[in-house]
């Protein structure tokens, strides 16, 4: 660092700026001599408004720095980002977003739960605000799944009246025949394959309704599609194997009690799907009068044997092999209770009593002719099947 | 010696978003300074946008903060400009520069963005 | 916004004049920091603008010793002692004091 050009003339000598030191520390600095500034943990060295790593000044011959003296400014994270369905709190102070300042990020309550960490986040050094866990991304309000007004039990086709936020995420799709589907989040819609088949090159052409309970009443949340994804392995008029599609919509809807997503099942779901277990199926499809049901309607169905399912189905007019594994079937060997044609597409559910969070076992898929007929069975798509299919999509798009 | 590239590209439908990328050689990204976008319509008049720093922080020009977002991609060495709702009012060619104690010390070549229906 | 108003538009010159063009600014670019980021830009038809000075008078390299910056506050100046051919272009100023950074409208030297 020491050059000793005698003719030269030493430079100013340099003043750290506040928060920052000089190095080295030299008597004097002459030709081609060079300090460095350094700012303390939570300063940021600024050229003006410029961010810089590092600094080094040279000092040149007619006795001037090459570069003017930077600043140590404390670091400011900036405003934090919103936080969709949820609030962010100052912790530190009104509006104080400089270093080691600290905000808590908090969802809606009831509806909404915090996905990723516990929503503290510090202003760090680097000028990002940090979660405990490192991360930088304000943290996720993630839909409450699965609550329903509806209390369990209690006695579509044979069925009876639902009430407000008995069903939430049931929704009803038009732009076709009506069908139905389970809202999942806050931005997908499961469905059958076959009820919107017709429309995968049109997803815009689906009218999809939320929050409602009455088919035809003009109080409801509309939604629109923003694509369509049917199972690769369901083939359209022959079988109902792989029966099973999505539709994201082009935004997210607010959650409330009459529009809440339904829970997919855990990995030990199974296990409140035995044989003979309750599921509940709801729709606006077909009553024993034969018209589409005008109020929302629920029906409450046990879980049958699959063999017994499957040899149901293997006498004419249906072929052997109707019924997969990808399927399970519920409902009375006496008949009266069932889904019907306008409830494809809907959700049977579950409760999880571990949970008491209902989630969705099975899709309405096909059935025998005649709804509710004895010794035949709704047939549903069996969605823990499908769970890997579902998050990939999910995830990906 | 650090040298910039914008590309994208050249032609933009009104409302639709604008896209470009900045290919930088000879200096790392995430070394030191602030990354740049600059733009000049016609009549020559230039106008600042915004810069993600060496950190990957990012500060907008205020009136275009609503529409604009600087991102970059350090395995790549780019950074990118992505402009919302363009009209085109947003017809200009679009620079990436590199700062130090300055500015603007090193500037790439630029590309013209037309925005027409 | 700071304003940086350029004089003249056009500068008509002849190769080896000294040639002289005004920047003012809205006002003062002096930093909270002390330093005044005033800058000066150059740009030939079709290429982009090429650094020529910084914080008011400070020579970005390579860029040849004809070339000066002066002043301060509000009020600052580029000197060209004498203009050679590969000078001629749109000159701007610029300020990084204040943020929304600024430039000029430009000045254009051309051979009269």
């Known amino acids: 660092h020491h050059h000793h050009h005698h003719a030269s003339q030493p430079c100013p000598y340099p003043m750290a700026p506040p928060n920052g030191h000089l190095s080295p520390v030299q008597a004097k600095y002459i030709l081609k001599d060079s300090f460095s500034i350094f700012c303390e943990p939570g300063y940021e060295l600024l050229q003006g408004h410029l961010p810089l790593k590092s600094f080094a000044a040279v000092c040149q011959k007619d006795g001037s720095w090459d570069q003017p003296m930077p600043s140590c400014s404390i670091v400011d994270c900036g405003p934090p980002d919103d936080l969709p369905s949820g609030r962010v709190e100052y912790i530190t102070g009104p509006e104080v977003t400089t270093y080691k300042a600290v905000i808590q990020y908090s969802c809606e309550e009831t509806f909404y739960t915090m996905k990723v960490n516990d929503g503290k986040y510090v202003c760090e050094a680097d000028g990002f605000w940090t979660s405990s866990k490192g991360e930088r991304s304000p943290p996720v309000c993630e839909p409450v799944c699965g609550l329903s007004a509806r209390t369990t039990g209690g006695r579509i086709y044979g069925g009876q009246k639902a009430k407000p936020g008995d069903f939430p995420w049931q929704v009803l799709i038009l732009g076709g025949s009506t069908a139905a589907g389970a809202l999942l989040y806050d931005n997908w819609v499961l469905t059958a394959a076959h009820a919107i088949y017709e429309q995968k090159h049109d997803a815009s052409s689906l009218d999809i309704r939320l929050g409602a309970l009455k088919r035809l009443s003009p109080h409801y949340t509309q939604a629109w599609a923003e694509a369509v994804f049917i199972h690769e392995g369901y083939t359209h008029d022959a079988g109902f194997d792989n029966d099973i599609a999505l539709i994201k919509l082009n935004n997210k809807v607010v959650i409330n009690s009459n529009i809440t997503p339904i829970c997919l099942p855990r990995k030990e779901a199974e296990s409140f799907m035995r044989t003979d277990d309750i599921g509940t199926a709801s729709g606006w499809g077909l009553t024993q009068r034969g018209l589409l049901a005008r109020n929302l309607m629920y029906v409450d169905i046990p879980i049958v044997d699959h063999q017994k399912c499957t040899a149901a189905y293997e006498k004419p007019p249906y072929s052997g092999g109707s019924v997969t594994a990808n399927m399970l079937c519920a409902g009375l060997e006496s008949g009266g209770k069932d889904s019907c044609r306008g409830d494809a597409g809907g959700a049977l559910v579950f409760l999880d009593n571990e949970t008491q969070r209902w989630f969705v076992g099975g899709i309405v898929s096909w059935g025998s002719m005649n709804c509710g007929e004895a010794g035949q069975y709704g047939v549903y798509t069996k969605v823990i099947n499908y769970i890997p299919w579902i998050k990939n999509i999910i995830s990906n798009f | 010696e650090v040298q910039l590239q914008e590309s994208g590209p050249g032609l933009v439908k009104p409302s639709q978003s604008l896209s470009l990328a900045c290919t930088v050689t000879?200096?790392?990204?995430?070394?030191?300074?602030?990354w740049h976008w600059i733009r000049q319509f016609p009549g020559n008049k230039l106008e600042w946008m915004g810069f993600?720093?060496?950190?990957?922080?990012?500060n907008y020009n205020p009136p275009l903060t609503s529409r604009i977002s600087i991102t970059r991609d350090t395995s790549k060495n780019q950074f990118f400009l992505q402009l919302n709702s363009v009209t085109t009012e947003d017809t200009a060619t679009y620079y990436c520069?590199?700062?130090?104690?300055?500015?603007?010390?090193?500037w790439g070549q630029g590309t013209l963005v037309t925005v027409s229906a | 916004n700071v304003l940086m108003t350029q004089t003249p538009l056009s500068l008509p010159v002849s190769l080896g004049d000294q040639a002289s063009i005004s920047c003012r600014s809205s006002?003062?670019?002096?930093?909270?920091?002390?330093?005044?980021?005033l800058e000066w830009y150059m740009q030939k038809p079709g290429q982009s603008p090429k650094l020529l000075i910084y914080?008011?008078?400070r020579r970005f390299s390579g860029v040849p010793d004809r070339f000066s910056g002066s002043g301060s506050g509000t009020d600052f100046t580029l000197k060209i002692s004498r203009v050679e051919a590969e000078d001629l272009g749109v000159y701007y100023c610029?300020?990084?004091?204040?943020?929304?950074?600024?430039f000029g409208a430009g000045t254009k030297l051309e051979l009269k």
């Open positions: 000879g200096y790392s990204i995430t070394s030191d300074y602030a």
């Open positions: 610029f300020q990084g004091s204040h943020v929304p950074v600024t």
């Open positions: 520069a590199r700062s130090y104690d300055y500015w603007f010390g090193y």
């Open positions: 993600i720093s060496y950190s990957g922080r990012t």
């Open positions: 006002q003062s670019l002096v930093h909270s920091n002390g330093n005044t980021y």
């Open positions: 914080t008011v008078s």
